[in-house]
């Protein structure tokens, strides 16, 4: 008799999830010599232990604590780049500007980027059929709790000037419900962070509006100012040129506004 299985509203665990996490860990430790000492089997065991045999709507930050310990890493606190709804450009930027870090440039972020996972209560099975959706099912699911945990810790670690890349093509350039708006903004430490600098990325080539005047950016400025952190904002009118100028800052066309 087949066992009844909970049907969730979200997609199931990414296929070959264990193999993917293990392979990513090995690759990361090969690329980053300072992480060569990491035992990837132990990392996978800790990752698995956070959600296997647990109800996928009852996951806590504490469940991920063993994984957090194994993911200990040096991140220059003044070189942190946060992002919201514009992940690809943020990652392209840090691939060029190698001394800056997004969360996905760390081991823990790299392991989980774009993956979905969940288990089932009282069985050691991974659920490849469906996983809880944050809105339709529950917020304390394995994926959401993981990203909330690492995002909170990443923001807590930041100091001096923190940069955030925001998508100027979206109706809400700053969205209070995004991970940046709901977690990272509130976990920047005012005693360590002097300024949050927003980079608003324009989508259209002919878009010359000052999106730093957008009401949602003003809302972000208000939230940040109330936390005793300074706020600044820059328009990135030409993201393609912006990246090109990060690669080749000496280029004569890079002295004008990007």
């Amino acid at each position: 008799v087949p066992r009844w299985r909970q049907q969730w509203s979200g997609p199931g665990t990414t296929k070959r999830f264990p193999e993917t996490v293990l392979a990513r860990c090995v690759k990361y430790t090969e690329i980053h010599p300072e992480m060569r000492h990491v035992d990837c089997q132990s990392v996978w065991d800790a990752f698995k232990g956070a959600f296997i045999s647990k109800h996928p709507c009852n996951i806590t930050e504490e469940d991920y604590q063993p994984l957090m310990k194994l993911g200990t890493q040096t991140v220059p606190c003044n070189k942190i780049l946060l992002w919201s709804r514009i992940k690809d450009l943020a990652h392209q930027f840090t691939q060029v500007q190698r001394d800056m870090f997004t969360l996905e440039d760390t081991l823990l972020g790299y392991l989980a980027d774009d993956l979905t996972w969940c288990g089932e209560f009282n069985t050691s099975k991974i659920n490849y059929q469906s996983c809880p959706d944050w809105r339709k099912d529950c917020s304390n699911n394995p994926v959401s709790v993981f990203w909330k945990t690492v995002s909170r810790r990443f923001a807590e670690a930041a100091c001096d000037v923190v940069h955030v890349m925001l998508n100027g093509s979206r109706s809400k350039i700053f969205d209070k419900n995004s991970t940046f708006g709901s977690v990272e903004v509130h976990n920047l430490q005012p005693e360590k962070v002097q300024t949050l600098e927003a980079w608003v990325i324009h989508g259209g080539r002919e878009d010359s509006r000052d999106l730093c005047q957008d009401p949602t950016i003003k809302e972000l400025e208000s939230i940040i100012s109330k936390r005793n952190i300074q706020f600044s904002c820059k328009n990135i009118y030409r993201p393609d040129k912006f990246l090109q100028c990060v690669k080749n800052p000496e280029d004569s066309s890079c002295t004008s506004e990007i």
Partner: nanobody, 117 residues
Framework: EVQVLESGGGLVQPGDSLRLSCAAS????????MSWVRQAPGKGLEWVST????????DYADSVKGRFTISRDNSKNMLYLQMNSLRAEDTAVYYC??????????RGQGTLVTVSS
Amino acid sequence: EVQVLESGGGLVQPGDSLRLSCAASGFTFTNFAMSWVRQAPGKGLEWVSTISGSGGSTDYADSVKGRFTISRDNSKNMLYLQMNSLRAEDTAVYYCADGRGPFFDYRGQGTLVTVSS
């Protein structure tokens, strides 16, 4: 600006004890969890222990549990690590850092602990 200064390291024999100290300044000490991390020669950063801002909650790496004790004196902005039953594998530069990790940017020079017979 967060500043820390570690001290108390040295050369000891296996089984001996050491007490590391960390003087912190530039921030409201009680507002921050504090951690000890270490880096063995030729190895990466390893988390050792964390203590909450109030000092009421502590956590340890399995490799040091039962041998090391983290503590703090909030009136003096000081963090401590009492290390007993030291082993050769505890040889490392020890850093104190603000926060609970896993992302650390240590500000001090660290203090070298060498365990050798």
